[in-house]
């Protein structure tokens, strides 16, 4: 299909261009020299004008953006869907863990409820927030749980004669809890397990969300003017010569795409590393690195820790009686 | 030993989490995700090839367009940029990634570093310090049944199988997602630009 002779009309070009841009005022009636063209430089007369070239460039860049979006659609769907599923699944685990812990208190230590329910609720609220990326210290969460529980255990189970707990004696009891290692090494055990499992869970979710961000970024890339010109030349300049049905050469397309996507392709190395690192993380997510495992078993460890306090009750009551005597006197007054 | 509520426990020791026939644990779901993600490991290197294969390119025609003229599909001119004098393709590549891409690369570098830091070395699932403190019980069965807590009376074997499929309002099957399945080449050191994005199954 040779280029049209100078006397030929631009009828075919006109009808093709009409699809892109309603309004034919930019298409010459007959081929013109095209000396003002900047992209589709003609070897002879051309059916393109400068305005048409600009429209072609815009369309080429839009085409490219759409192609990129369709390329990433399945991957984007995969990560978005899984990020949502895992986030909800983790919240369900936390909810179950809270219910198990509350059930354990209700069935084994009814005198500690409803206060224990509130402390447990606070703890698991913080667990949820930590997983979602909040600036909360896991050790503080665990310490807070045991600091809160001990005054209630002491006033309800070990020394029931004390009046309704007041913040003053509670603060002394909270301090005693740490100083006397009232719960033995259970708080430390829980800290280790919870912090390890939650850290891994948190980074897993963080990584999935970053994956979405990576795909979104490349999905909405704006291509440079240079790229737009290359794409125009590849996809549309043939039209100017009346070659409507001709397609770009495969090798030429690859060269143009690599030029347009040179920046994007630089992500490749880090993307590969991202998937392999995520795989490594996932392979290690078991036992104390698996929040499902750790949180759903917390009720048992907390139960054991309270038994430990009960076992040492007599000794503790004497020591704490002396340690918090000042606060207790103030409370009785 | 603690009294465990009937609705939560079978046999007072094994945790019963959900009454669903389809067993799907969080860990199996994670592994499944990784397998699917690995099929996209070549996503970025394969993008140029994918886009060419999904845009009009001469496949069966004898003649094709090289940016300047009609040429034979297998001629030397076919792969050459027909107007290379107008502006340099090499120059375009040398400009480097645009700021948003550089930003995302930095974020990927950061998360990769975090992921590597957090990854558990094989065979080192529990900290040495924990082992030394004697807080880890001896043998607690396979990966599905892990012990938590100190040994002794209160030890509970937690059956690690929350079956979330039943509870989640999502259809977890990604296989019939919109868009074409994309596949590519699996070897890490060999990037082929075929008509695809991703990895060969």
């Amino acid at each position: 299909q040779p280029p049209p002779p100078p006397d030929a009309t631009c009828h075919q070009v006109r009808s093709f261009f009409q699809r892109l841009q309603p309004g034919l005022k930019w298409v010459p009636e007959t081929p013109v020299p095209g000396s003002d063209l900047q992209v589709c430089l003609p070897k002879g007369p051309t059916c393109c004008s400068r305005k048409m070239e600009e429209k072609y460039q815009l369309t080429a860049r839009l085409n490219m953006e759409q192609l990129l979006q369709s390329a990433s659609m399945e991957l984007k769907f995969l990560i978005i869907q899984n990020a949502a599923v895992f986030q909800e699944a983790f919240e369900i685990v936390v909810r179950h863990a809270k219910n198990y812990t509350n059930a354990m208190f209700k069935n084994n230590y009814p005198s500690l409820t409803p206060q224990a329910f509130e402390f447990v609720g606070e703890f698991f609220t913080d667990v949820s927030l930590y997983i979602l990326g909040s600036d909360i210290n896991v050790d503080d969460m665990v310490n807070e749980l045991f600091d809160s529980l001990f005054p209630v255990i002491y006033t309800q189970m070990m020394n029931p004669g004390l009046p309704e707990s007041v913040l003053d004696i509670n603060e002394c009891l909270r301090g005693a809890r740490r100083d006397l290692k009232v719960f033995g090494s259970f708080p430390k055990l829980i800290m280790t397990q919870v912090s390890k499992s939650l850290q891994v869970t948190r980074i897993f979710l963080q990584a999935l969300n970053l994956g979405i961000e990576v795909i979104n970024t490349t999905d909405h890339l704006k291509f440079s003017k240079d790229c737009g010109r290359m794409l125009t030349r590849m996809w549309y300049c043939s039209y100017c010569q009346g070659l409507m049905m001709v397609k770009p050469c495969g090798g030429y397309c690859n060269v143009v795409m690599q030029g347009c996507m040179a920046g994007v392709v630089e992500i490749d190395k880090y993307w590969r590393e991202y998937i392999l690192s995520l795989e490594e993380l996932v392979n290690g997510m078991y036992r104390i690195y698996d929040m499902e495992n750790v949180l759903l078993g917390l009720f048992s460890t907390i139960h054991d820790s309270i038994q430990y306090v009960q076992k040492n009750g007599g000794k503790l009551t004497t020591t704490i009686g002396k340690l918090c005597a000042h606060s207790q006197q103030r409370q009785y007054r | 030993s603690a009294y465990y509520p009937e609705d939560l426990f079978i046999d007072k020791k094994i945790l019963k989490v959900a009454h669903v026939e389809h067993e799907e644990t969080l860990s199996s779901r994670r592994r499944e995700l990784i397998q699917k993600l690995k099929s996209f490991i070549n996503f970025y290197s394969a993008l140029p090839g994918y886009i060419c294969s999904h845009s009009p390119v001469a496949e069966n025609d004898t003649l094709c367009w090289n940016g300047q003229e009609l040429v034979e599909r297998y001629s030397q001119k076919a792969a050459r940029n027909g107007m290379k004098n107008q502006f340099n393709l090499h120059e375009l590549k040398m400009k480097g990634p645009e700021p948003v891409v550089s930003q995302i690369i930095d974020k990927l570098k950061h998360i990769n570093q975090l992921l590597r830091t957090m990854s558990v070395p094989k065979g080192k699932v529990l900290d040495k310090s924990l082992d030394e403190e004697g807080l880890e019980s001896g043998d607690c069965g396979d990966d599905e049944d892990e012990c938590i807590g100190s040994s002794g009376d209160g030890m509970v074997k937690v059956k690690n199988q929350l079956r979330f499929l039943a509870e989640l309002a999502y259809d977890l099957d990604v296989d019939d997602a919109p868009g074409n399945k994309q596949h590519g080449n699996q070897k890490d050191n060999e990037i082929t630009t075929s008509h695809s994005v991703g990895n060969m199954p």
Epitope: Q115, F119, L132, S134, D135, E144, E171 | -
Partner: antibody, heavy 116, light 102 residues
């Protein structure tokens, strides 16, 4: 931006129940980490915390007023309601509702204008 | 009587540094927040989590917290800083305010 507005009766007879509504915009009570709290301030006195409701419907109450207070939320209407039973002249105060960031140790970062 | 103790009043010459304390048993282990309240207005958060300043709060406001005392510092106090200041902390499941410092 975040705004909160308290509404309710200006006068309540002793022994009656006070119902206060906090209508807010700029955030949702279904977002993880968000809470809404109620605080009161008798004329010329200090601030006193009454109740706090979390995004996950957990509720916290002042121990000294717990038996008289109920806090509820209507996520779709962007409202939180506080009811206080058995009102007494000593309960005369300006009642504020505030947005709480639960993760930041329950800080109250945005306050309503208050209702007397 | 509040578990968080604040001096009822404090005064400072303009341009000088004002320090308001908030005392409480082992308060250093808690996160303390500070609010400023001008007459007839709602309280405004000026410092949260001991030391953090919300956007829009001047740099002259700073906080610290250790042992049994949390402190709000106003460096180069200005007449517009005249107000009541309240400290607040979260005790397990209870929100506690100090008695306020004028």
């Amino acid at each position: 931006q975040v705004t909160l507005k308290e509404s309710g009766p200006t006068l309540v007879k002793p022994t009656q129940t006070l119902t206060l509504t906090c209508t807010f915009s700029g955030f949702s009570l279904s977002t993880s980490g968000v809470g809404v709290g109620w605080i009161r301030q008798p004329p010329g006195k200090a601030l006193e915390w009454l109740a706090l409701i979390y995004w996950n419907d957990d509720k916290r109450y002042s121990p000294s007023l717990k038996s008289r207070l109920t806090i509820t939320k209507d996520t779709s209407k962007n409202q939180v309601v506080l009811t206080m039973t058995n009102m007494d002249p000593v309960d005369t105060a300006t009642y504020y509702c505030a947005h709480s960031r639960i993760a930041a140790r329950r800080v109250l970062d945005y306050w309503g204008q208050g209702t007397l | 009587q509040s578990v968080l103790t604040q001096p009822p009043s404090a005064s400072v010459a303009p341009g000088k540094t004002a320090r308001i304390t908030c005392g409480g048993n082992n308060i250093g282990s808690k996160s303390v927040h500070w609010y400023q309240q001008k007459p007839g207005q709602s309280p405004v958060l000026v410092i949260y989590q001991d030391t953090k300043r919300p956007s829009g709060i001047p740099e002259r406001f700073s906080g610290s917290n250790s042992g049994n005392t949390a402190t709000l510092t106003i460096s180069g106090a200005q007449p517009m800083d005249e107000a009541d200041y309240y400290c607040q902390a979260w005790y397990s499941t209870i929100m506690v305010f100090g008695g306020g410092t004028k």
